[in-house]
């Protein structure tokens, strides 16, 4: 797929790794919350 224009911003390059890590952390937390919710249900 075509890269979005924002990928040309230097910031995108310098923060790519940390933003990916933050997103993965967010997803993991979301999955954990979902699991807890399922347990309650």
């Amino acid at each position: 797929s075509e890269e979005p224009p924002i990928s040309l911003d230097l910031t995108f390059h310098l923060l790519r790794e940390v933003l990916e890590m933050a997103r993965a952390e967010q997803l993991a937390q979301q999955a954990h919350s979902n699991r807890k919710l399922m347990e309650i249900i």
Epitope: P5, D9, F12, L19
Partner: antibody, heavy 118, light 112 residues
Framework: QVQLVQSGAEVKKPGASVKVSCKAS????????MKWVRQAPGQRLEWMGV????????FYNQKFKGRVTITRDTSASTAYMELSSLRSEDTAVYYC???????????WGQGTLVTVSS | DVVMTQSPLSLPVTLGQPASISCRSG???????????LEWYQQRPGQSPRLLIY???NRFSGVPDRFSGSGSGTDFTLKISRVEAEDLGVYYC?????????FGGGTKVEIK
């Protein structure tokens, strides 16, 4: 031309919160990250955080994590920075800034003075 | 955090004469991609900062050629070949190679 126009000066009491806005024009708002930097009297410039207006990803300087919230409204081409639990040391000029493909802070807002005083 | 140390704190200059500002980083600011994200900013009294130099030695668009940047690793310099009245203000170095991004403490260029 690229323009970043910030909201006006604010005076706040310790413990309160402040929300500063930054309206972008002259370019496609979602094509560039927006950063926030502050300058307290007699202190060096401090980078506070950054938002990807396209996807909403945010990354904060650990120093401010928990107290600062950066958001955006793409329909209004505006970024916001909210700082909570204000103390006197937060008295500063707050800037929004945008980079390019070559540099991190190529264009700056005019700055917003936030004064925290009881 | 990478500490950026500038010297001198204050630089009295004579208009038309050269000026030089030093910036040292507490550790190497060569990024893992082999680039050095060292930038210089000028802040005139009462104004917002303005980008002068990016990646150590590249002038940003509209910046006069009397400004030049050099250095590598941990040691960087901003030179003004002939200081003009409009150059008076505070100059900051900045590193974007390591998070958190950090600025130097500033050097005030003033009339002697």
């Amino acid at each position: 031309q690229v323009q970043l126009v910030q909201s006006g000066a604010e005076v706040k009491k310790p413990g309160a919160s402040v929300k500063v806005s930054c309206k972008a024009s002259g370019y496609t708002f979602t094509d560039y990250f927006m950063k926030w930097v502050r300058q307290a009297p007699g202190q060096r410039l401090e980078w506070m955080g950054v938002i990807n207006p396209n996807q909403g990803d945010i990354f904060y300087n650990q120093k401010f994590k928990g107290r600062v919230t950066i958001t955006r409204d793409t329909s209004a081409s505006t970024a916001y920075m909210e700082l909570s639990s204000l103390r006197s040391e937060d008295t500063a000029v707050y800037y929004c800034a945008r980079g390019t493909d070559r540099a991190l802070f190529a264009y700056w807002g005019q700055g917003t003075l936030v004064t925290v005083s009881s | 955090d990478v500490v950026m140390t500038q010297s001198p704190l204050s630089l009295p200059v004579t208009l038309g004469q050269p000026a030089s500002i030093s910036c040292r980083s507490g550790q190497s600011i060569v990024h893992s991609d082999a680039n050095t994200y060292l930038e210089w900013y000028q802040q005139r009294p009462g104004q917002s900062p303005r980008l002068l130099i990016y990646k150590v030695s590249n002038r940003f668009s509209g910046v006069p050629d009397r400004f030049s940047g050099s250095g590598s690793g941990t040691d960087f310099t901003l030179k003004i070949s002939r200081v003009e009245a409009e150059d008076l203000g505070v100059y900051y170095c900045f590193q974007g190679s390591h998070i958190p991004w950090t600025f130097g403490g500033g050097t005030k260029v003033e009339i002697k």
